[in-house]
Interface confidence: low
């Protein structure tokens, strides 16, 4: 049994059509409005799951539902990356995957979704209310981040309802990078709105039906609840964060690491060789265990699905926390 908390993606509002029958000319404007509102605001979903074992392990899954190509995914805990959060893993579609204790088995599930396993227990395990965040950098949308956590009262083995506490945040790059193609449409929309301002405008209503998924995903998290914006990040006790994450990476990482955009330049502690393979197909994901990687050519771990606990030695920094008895 497992405890789950899902943060479903925010679904774009569907224009209400009531009262619009006699105003067919408003259909296009409202379609444009929807596009203008949702353009550049791709959806990100986060699912946090805790396995019910003494040596509890957490599985974090994140997906990007935008239309752009993903250039980097950063997973952190304790808050957003760069805002008090600690980087757990960075996944690059071509450069490979890098992870830091207690992260394990970070991998691509599809070209737009990833999963990550955290080993944990004892002093090094994540607390039940730990916030996990996934940040997707894509072109042309920019960077988008969503966060999720287990319900505070979750007990291993008890099913928990989805947590409607996502945080979607567009970096400046995302805001500025919004496709300019719709600019004209937005201007035109404003023009039409001014022309029709004497007419009643249909209300925008949140969809209460099954949300539309912009893209297919390997598995679809239930959309049991609409996610709300601007939910404050949960704070976590320092005791819930592995001390191994407090040490700066002494080597500086691979050469390409330094050339990453600043939003991804938060260097996690502990080294791990980067796999230089392109996005592997399902079933052959390159995983950089917490730190056991030696030279890139020495560890061929192609990971499949599976859970791992904190202290799984994974390469150069496999020092996750131990499996302490709770």
């Amino acid at each position: 049994m497992r405890t789950e908390a899902q943060v479903p993606a925010l679904q774009p509002p569907e224009p209400g059509l009531e009262g619009a029958m006699g105003h067919r000319t408003l259909v296009l404007p409202w379609v444009l409005l929807t596009l203008c509102v949702t353009a550049g605001t791709p959806e990100v979903w986060v699912q946090v799951r805790m396995e019910a074992t003494e040596l509890s392990s957490f599985t974090i899954r994140c997906g990007f539902l935008g239309s752009g190509s993903i250039s980097l995914v950063t997973v952190s805990w304790g808050g957003p990356n760069g805002a008090g959060g600690t980087t757990l893993a960075v996944l690059h579609p071509e450069r490979g995957i890098r992870q830091w204790a207690p992260a394990r088995q970070a991998r691509w599930e599809t070209q737009s979704s990833i999963s990550l396993i955290l080993e944990g227990s004892g002093a090094s395990s994540p607390c039940a209310n730990t916030t996990f965040c996934c940040k997707f950098a894509s072109f042309p949308e920019g960077s988008w981040e969503a966060c999720g956590s287990l319900p505070p009262s979750s007990d291993p083995g008890l099913s928990a309802p989805p947590t409607p506490a996502p945080i979607l945040r567009a970096d400046l790059a995302g805001i500025l990078g919004v496709s300019g193609v719709l600019l004209f449409g937005c201007v035109y929309l404003l023009h039409l709105l001014r022309r029709h301002k004497h007419r009643p405008a249909p209300r925008l209503q949140p969809s209460r039906t099954s949300p539309q998924a912009p893209r297919a995903r390997a598995w679809a998290p239930s959309q049991a609840s609409q996610a709300a914006l601007h939910v404050p990040y949960a704070t976590i006790n320092t005791s819930c964060r592995p001390a191994t994450l407090d040490t700066a990476h002494p080597h500086g990482g691979p050469s390409w690491w330094a050339s990453l955009p600043t939003h991804a330049a938060h260097r996690p502690q502990g080294p791990a060789a980067w796999a230089s393979t392109p996005i592997p197909a399902r079933g052959s994901f390159v995983s950089v265990e917490n730190g056991l990687y030696a030279q890139a050519g020495e560890r061929p771990p192609h990971t499949g699905p599976g859970l791992t606990l904190f202290p799984d030695p994974r390469g150069p920094r496999a020092m996750e926390g131990p499996l302490g008895v709770r």
Epitope: H249, G291, A294, G306, T308, D312, M319, L323
Partner: antibody
Framework: QVQLKESGPGLVAPSQSLSITCTVS????????VNWIRQPPGKGLEWLGV???????DYNSALKSRLSISKDNSKSQVFLKMNSLQTDDTARYFC????????WGQGTAVTVSS | NIVMTQSPKSMSMSVGERVTLNCTAS??????VSWYQQKPEQSPKLLIY???NRYTGVPDRFTGSGSATDFTLTISSVQAEDLGDYHC?????????FGSGTKLEIE
């Protein structure tokens, strides 16, 4: 309660193979990596390799050509196989869970002798 | 391979004394160092992980410190039951390596 228990042949003839099983309880092999470590009599510890929850393995490069680690998640067992044993492979072999090696088995003594 | 060098090789202390064990890594291992206690005829037990994190159930007289290449395990007031071998190990890079151990005897 987390427990690991190694079981092996005890005595192995030179050039023969060694097979040891580590049976675990209290946690799932799907979620944790298991390391193999050995300790020659009166000496220090030597890390042999690890098998991760996802089945991936990493080995000590000095022994990689002779080592093989596998597991059966359903039986909660991890297997170590080492080929071409020599007398200097005589040691107590331990399995331990996680990279920090939080829990260790009691070890199984292996003597390589003709 | 990263070489972990422990000192001293052995030491004899009286109950109540402060004990300091040292471990030096041949290269930077960040904070990925653990300390293990191995009593005679027993398997090692994790005491400290991540340089300074006391493992579950470990008495607070055991303290770990250090960074990069130099690490220390301190027993603030050694007890008779603390006798045995103490190993340091690094899980920063493959292969994981251990020090040769320090034997602690209680007078």
């Amino acid at each position: 309660q987390v427990q690991l228990k190694e079981s092996g042949p005890g005595l192995v003839a030179p050039s023969q193979s060694l097979s040891i099983t580590c049976t675990v309880s209290g946690f799932s092999l799907i979620g944790h990596g298991v390391n193999w470590i050995r300790q020659p009599p009166g000496k220090g510890l030597e890390w042999l390799g690890v098998i991760w929850g996802d089945g991936n393995t990493d080995y000590n490069s000095a022994l990689k050509s002779r080592l093989s680690i596998s597991k059966d998640n359903s039986k909660s067992q991890v297997f170590l196989k080492m080929n071409s044993l020599q007398t200097d492979d005589t040691a107590r072999y331990f399995c331990a869970v996680n990279s920090a090696m939080d829990y260790w088995g009691q070890g199984t003594a292996v003597t390589v002798s003709s | 391979n990263i070489v972990m060098t422990q000192s001293p090789k052995s030491m004899s202390m009286s109950v109540g004394e402060r004990v300091t064990l040292n471990c030096t890594a041949s290269e930077n291992v960040a904070s990925f160092v653990s300390w293990y206690q191995q009593k005679p005829e027993q398997s090692p037990k994790l005491l400290i992980y991540g340089t300074s994190n006391r493992y579950t159930g470990v008495p607070d007289r055991f303290t770990g410190s250090g960074s990069a290449t130099d690490f220390t395990l301190t027993i603030s007031s050694v007890q008779a039951e603390d006798l045995g071998d103490y190993h340091c190990g690094q899980s920063y890079n493959y292969p994981f390596t251990f020090g040769s151990g320090t034997k602690l005897e209680i007078e």
